[in-house]
Interface confidence: medium
């Protein structure tokens, strides 16, 4: 599964949209979790409403908000007031019982100060592909990676 690398500015909001097959994932809740390591579990940050028909309602945990458009097949996660500590590897997941199917892997990077490094334009160069592999972002730049990681729990 490809990993999309998204960059946001500290203090701003970062919005991630993970797309999925609406029919295949009919009735399933969605979750946003943080993968701590190769062997470790994915630590749940926030999940959509417990009643699937109400999944369009925003659910918040701290500064992270999730909402699911089940008809369009798009789950949207917003990281508000982005901080350096929010940087990390995350997953959009579709939940079925105790099983979690990974919809998208997202590596979040936080740019602390737009004026901090005048070579930032050289450092964060987008990959050749401009495709977001099913994840889109606002208020950020992004570079798409071809990373394939081993399965995680």
């Amino acid at each position: 599964l490809n990993t999309t690398v998204l960059q946001g500015m500290a203090g701003q909001s970062l919005r991630v949209s993970c797309t999925y097959d609406a029919l295949k994932h009919w009735g399933r809740r969605k979750a946003w979790c943080r993968q701590l390591g190769e062997e470790g579990p994915c630590q749940r940050v926030v999940s959509t409403h417990g009643v699937w028909l109400l999944a369009f309602l925003k659910k918040r945990n701290g500064s992270t908000v999730i909402a699911d458009d089940t008809l369009a097949g798009t789950v949207t996660i917003t990281l508000k007031n982005l901080q350096a500590g929010d940087a990390g590897l995350y997953q959009c997941q579709s939940l079925r019982g105790r099983e979690a199917e990974v919809l998208q892997k997202v590596l979040v990077e936080v740019l602390e100060d737009p004026l901090d490094d005048q070579d930032a334009g050289d450092l964060w160069v987008p990959e050749e592909s401009s495709s977001f592999e099913g994840a889109q972002v606002e208020h950020s730049t992004s570079r798409n990676q071809e990373t394939s990681f081993p399965p995680t729990s």
């Epitope: 500590g85 990390g88 936080v110 990959e127 570079r143 071809e146 990681f149």
Partner: antibody
Framework: EVQLLESGGGLVQPGGSLRLSCAAS????????MAWVRQAPGKGLEWVSS????????YYADSVKGRFTISRDNSKNTLYLQMNSLRAEDTAVYYC????????????WGQGTLVTVSS | DIQMTQSPSSLSASVGDRVTITCKAS??????LAWYQQKPGKAPKLLIY???NRFTGVPSRFSGSGSGTDFTLTISSLQPEDFATYYC?????????FGQGTKLEIK
């Protein structure tokens, strides 16, 4: 077992060039970001450069930007560091390291190769 | 760039002692911190990632804690093989900055 074996170090004059190699085995090389980290004699660790698993994006410390080039050949399971315009302050042991998922933490390291820049 | 400062720079202790090494970030880094151990003439080894997660094969006497700007590495009962230099490192945001190191010596 993960193994990283660096080579190519040696003595070079200021302004000269050197290419380091790192042969990787024991894991699917093409799935992982890789990096170079150096350590000057008696000093601490300094990250030098990283690149993505595809090699499509590269990252450099300010101290080497424009002089060093990181690259990889996934078909040969090998990581490279081309070092040009070498300075005395580049003298260090250079370690090749496997980086987990673009995180910047290095879970496996090579034994290092010494680069000495001196006239 | 965020700076990482370790204290103390060096530390003398005895086998069986409980030892704590601290690392301070110049800005909030959440839990994005790793710890490494390095013995003379050897490559560093990853001990702890994401503040408190022990890497594969790391003994349970090593533990990490903290959040934000202040972090600690604790060795609950020093063993002879633990005498080494320890480095903290800020992760997940380039440049990957290391602390200056803490040398743990035998008293």
């Amino acid at each position: 077992e993960v193994q990283l074996l660096e080579s190519g170090g040696g003595l070079v004059q200021p302004g000269g060039s050197l290419r380091l190699s790192c042969a990787a085995s024991g894991f699917t090389f093409s799935n992982y970001y890789m990096a170079w980290v150096r350590q000057a004699p008696g000093k601490g660790l300094e990250w030098v450069s990283s690149l993505t698993n595809s090699g499509g994006s590269t990252y450099y410390a300010d101290s080497v930007k424009g002089r060093f080039t990181i690259s990889r050949d996934n078909s040969k399971n090998t990581l490279y560091l081309q070092m040009n315009s070498l300075r005395a302050e580049d003298t260090a042991v250079y370690y090749c390291a496997k980086e987990w998922a673009g995180s910047g933490y290095f879970d496996y390291w090579g034994q290092g190769t010494l680069v000495t820049v001196s006239s | 760039d965020i700076q990482m400062t370790q204290s103390p720079s060096s530390l003398s202790a005895s086998v069986g002692d409980r030892v704590t090494i601290t690392c301070k970030a110049s800005q909030n880094v959440g839990n994005n911190l790793a710890w490494y151990q390095q013995k003379p003439g050897k490559a560093p080894k990853l001990l702890i990632y994401y503040t408190s997660n022990r890497f594969t094969g790391v003994p349970s006497r090593f533990s990490g804690s903290g959040s934000g700007t202040d972090f600690t590495l604790t060795i609950s009962s020093l063993q002879p093989e633990d005498f080494a230099t320890y480095y903290c490192q800020r992760i997940y945001n380039s440049p990957w900055t290391f602390g200056q190191g803490t040398k743990l010596e035998i008293k």
